[in-house]
């Protein structure tokens, strides 16, 4: 069997809402993945599990099941959404995210995703981790790759 390549492209959109009284931030983050099947047979993308971390704390998890089948030598782009909550110990971020005097309220989030594929009864897992900028102050749609956070912590490809 040849490889199945999973490429995390980036954040596609982030929709934000707030709980004023509980000083809580709700971020619905939609991410984009490219999955390439380099084989001469079809593979099934069985599930995608994702989680988002802020400041080493998991703030959101998502799981998609029975997603798609990728044909031989084909590539599919898949979007998945992770609902996240920044609250309680992190409610200090509410002030930053709702501060009117600044235009962009970027926070750094670590996106983790694991893709499980199957073919001929064989299962394979591929994981990716990326640090991304997300604006927690307004609804934002990103150009693919625009939210990339480039620093020494960025895992190597």
């Amino acid at each position: 069997p040849r490889s199945i390549d999973v490429k995390y492209i980036g954040v596609k959109s982030a929709y934000v809402s707030y709980d004023v009284q509980k000083r809580t931030i709700y971020l619905n983050i939609t991410n984009t993945l490219n999955i390439t099947n380099n084989n001469y047979y079809s593979v099934e993308v069985e599930n995608i599990t994702a989680q988002v971390q802020f400041s080493k704390t998991v703030i959101g998890k998502a799981r998609l099941n029975n997603i798609t089948i990728i044909g031989p030598l084909d590539m599919k782009q898949i979007d998945y959404t992770v609902p996240t909550v920044i609250a309680e110990e992190m409610s200090y971020m509410y002030d930053f995210c709702t501060l009117i005097s600044i235009k962009v309220h970027n926070i750094v989030l670590m996106m983790q995703v694991t893709v499980t594929t199957t073919y001929f009864g064989h299962s394979e897992q591929i994981s990716q981790e990326r640090y991304q900028y997300v604006d927690c102050g307004r609804n934002t749609t990103y150009q693919l790759g625009q939210s990339e956070y480039l620093n020494v912590l960025q895992p190597q490809q």
Epitope: S17, Y18, D19, V20, Q21, K22, Y26, E89
Partner: antibody
Amino acid sequence: QVQLQQSGAELAKPGASVKLSCKASGYTFTSYWMHWVKQRPGQGLEWIGYVNPSSGYTKNNQKFKDKVTLTADKSSSTAYMQLSSLTYEDSAVYYCAREGGSISDWYFDVWGTGTTVTVSS
Amino acid sequence: DIVMTQAAPSVPVTPGESVSISCRSSKSLLHSNGNTYSYWFLQRPGQSPQLLIYRMSNLASGVPDRFSGSGSGTAFTLRISRVEAEDVGVYYCMQHLEYPYTFGGGTKLEIK
């Protein structure tokens, strides 16, 4: 129906500690934050703090930071407030109150029966 | 901390008449989402407080429509039309916007 049943009156000496309880019934305990409010005899209401029964997270009024410990037991649907190093100023009625509602629209919709704490030597 | 002030410690009223109880906050309780986070509670003698009005003007469940709330960002009014004997007690305003939540000192409604 939704009820908050608080423990009975407490008589304690200065320097001692007391633990008050607030047993919730008629709703899902972990779905709503529980707040505590103090009322000294013949006086107004003072917000002490809250506990989120789901996570155990608490937030206290700074004024009560070293005085109060808030906890919750999911298995018995009971919230607790411990008052330590009691002084005469701690003599009051203490209420628990459920914070009902929904996002950005919360309010104290159900109040407990109140527990009277008397500090006397 | 936001200070809630109820200037009148007590208000006398004749049954069947209307009465207004006022409250002021040291900071605006009007949020940019359009909601005003002021609340009114009634504490009848020997009882626990009960919610009357939430978000300045919304009537709580089970409260008679004789009660109504109004105001601006910093000035709030609770109006009781056709006062009944059961309305006696202490009325408290509260801000539910910023920690620590704070209450007014209370206004006692007394029947003449």
